[in-house]
Interface confidence: low
């Protein structure tokens, strides 16, 4: 087995295709290593943009794995980061290789609202609950919430009745349908048999990213009784 | 990658008249707020004025009656018209966008534009 004494100066060589991937705000930094004769360990540091006196921060020390979870180091979510990646073989390091400007906000994913369907007399109401994401190890929602830029602004609501779709729109912000849980949604019902699908996605401040559309839910309308 | 990209600028003489645009490359249709931020030399980056999706605007005191922000939702572009330039309006502008607050504050983003110098002076 080759030993460190063996490698040059510069032949600790330098992790490649760093990536960061972010679903419901939890961002996890991923990049590739060639095999080598001695098992390499990898240090992961993060950048914020946005914070006063910026430095590097280290996320992961010493890993072994190909992967490391950097929630705990994004600021506001809006911002842009940057992360790097350097191998170390015994005790040489390699240089360190840099991932693109990444926004949590901007550049994740987040996951579909949940929707509930029911009628209420004569109209329907939806409930659109906010999907949970976790911020620094916090389950949250992604409500309206003044103290961060990333939230979501506006859902679209997608309600097909016997084959003819209609959009509405939910602004967040407008306490009259909407709090820290869910928003709400009322339709009225015509008197003829129907049958309503409902699907929804959010509108993401600040640059309209939308989350996942969610899976359509259904109510049929039997003469004014329902069907589920 | 999206960006803010501003034009304008210059040396102009007091009294005298300017505009900025901030060209934003995405629609600016879903972006709750905009604003206008100015550092002088040697000071810190400071509020001029915002505007909301809807139009509304807000302003320093020391911007009210001179300045005005607006917006074109079809071209993607803010604009800062600056009338009866004084010298101690003498800085770097720069667009953000951001978010308003329910009490009425504006929050900035990281999205700025590169920042267009305004020097005023005779």
């Known amino acids: 087995e080759m030993g460190t004494a063996d490698l040059g100066p510069s032949s600790v060589p330098t992790p490649t295709n760093v990536t960061i991937e972010s679903y419901n705000m939890n961002p996890i930094v991923y990049w590739e290593y060639q095999i080598m004769p001695q098992v390499p360990v990898f240090t992961v540091e993060v950048k914020n943009y946005g914070v006063k006196n910026s430095e590097w921060i280290d996320a992961c020390i010493n890993i072994s794995h190909h992967y490391c979870n950097i929630s705990d180091h994004v600021g506001d979510p809006s911002n842009s980061l940057w992360v790097r990646v350097k191998a170390r073989v015994g005790q040489k390091e390699s240089a360190y290789a840099k991932s693109e400007e990444f926004a949590v906000c901007r550049d994740g994913k987040i996951g579909p609202p949940k929707l509930d369907i029911r009628k209420e007399e004569k109209q329907i109401m939806i409930d659109i609950f906010h999907p949970s994401v976790f911020v620094n190890g916090d389950e949250q929602e992604v409500d309206y919430d003044p103290e961060t830029t990333c939230y979501i602004r506006v859902y679209n609501v997608y309600v097909r009745m016997n084959g003819s779709e209609i959009q509405y729109k939910i602004l967040t912000q407008k306490e009259d349908d909407c709090d820290e849980i869910q928003c709400q949604l009322a339709i009225p019902v015509s008197s003829l048999n129907s049958q309503y699908c409902v699907s929804a996605e959010g509108v993401l401040h600040v640059w309209g990213v939308t989350t996942e559309k969610s899976k359509e839910v259904c109510i049929t309308i039997f003469n004014s009784s329902i069907k589920g | 990658q999206v960006q803010l990209q501003q034009f304008g600028g210059g040396l102009v003489q007091p009294g005298g008249s300017l505009r900025l645009s901030c060209a934003v490359s995405r629609s600016i249709f879903s972006i709750d707020a905009m604003a206008w931020y100015r550092q002088a030399p040697g000071k810190q980056r400071n509020l001029v004025g915002t505007?909301?999706?809807?139009?509304?605007?807000n302003y320093v005191d020391s911007a009210k009656g001179r300045f005005t922000i607006s917006r074109d939702n079809a071209k993607n572009t803010v604009y800062l018209q600056m009338n009866s330039l004084k010298p101690e309006d003498t800085a770097v502008y720069f667009c953000?966008?951001?978010?308003?607050?329910?009490?009425?504050?504006?929050?900035?983003?990281?999205?700025w534009g590169q920042g267009t110098l305004v020097t005023v002076s005779s």
């Open positions: 953000n966008a951001g978010a308003v607050s329910r009490t009425g504050g504006y929050r900035p983003s990281g999205y």
């Open positions: 505007i909301t999706s809807d139009g509304t605007t």
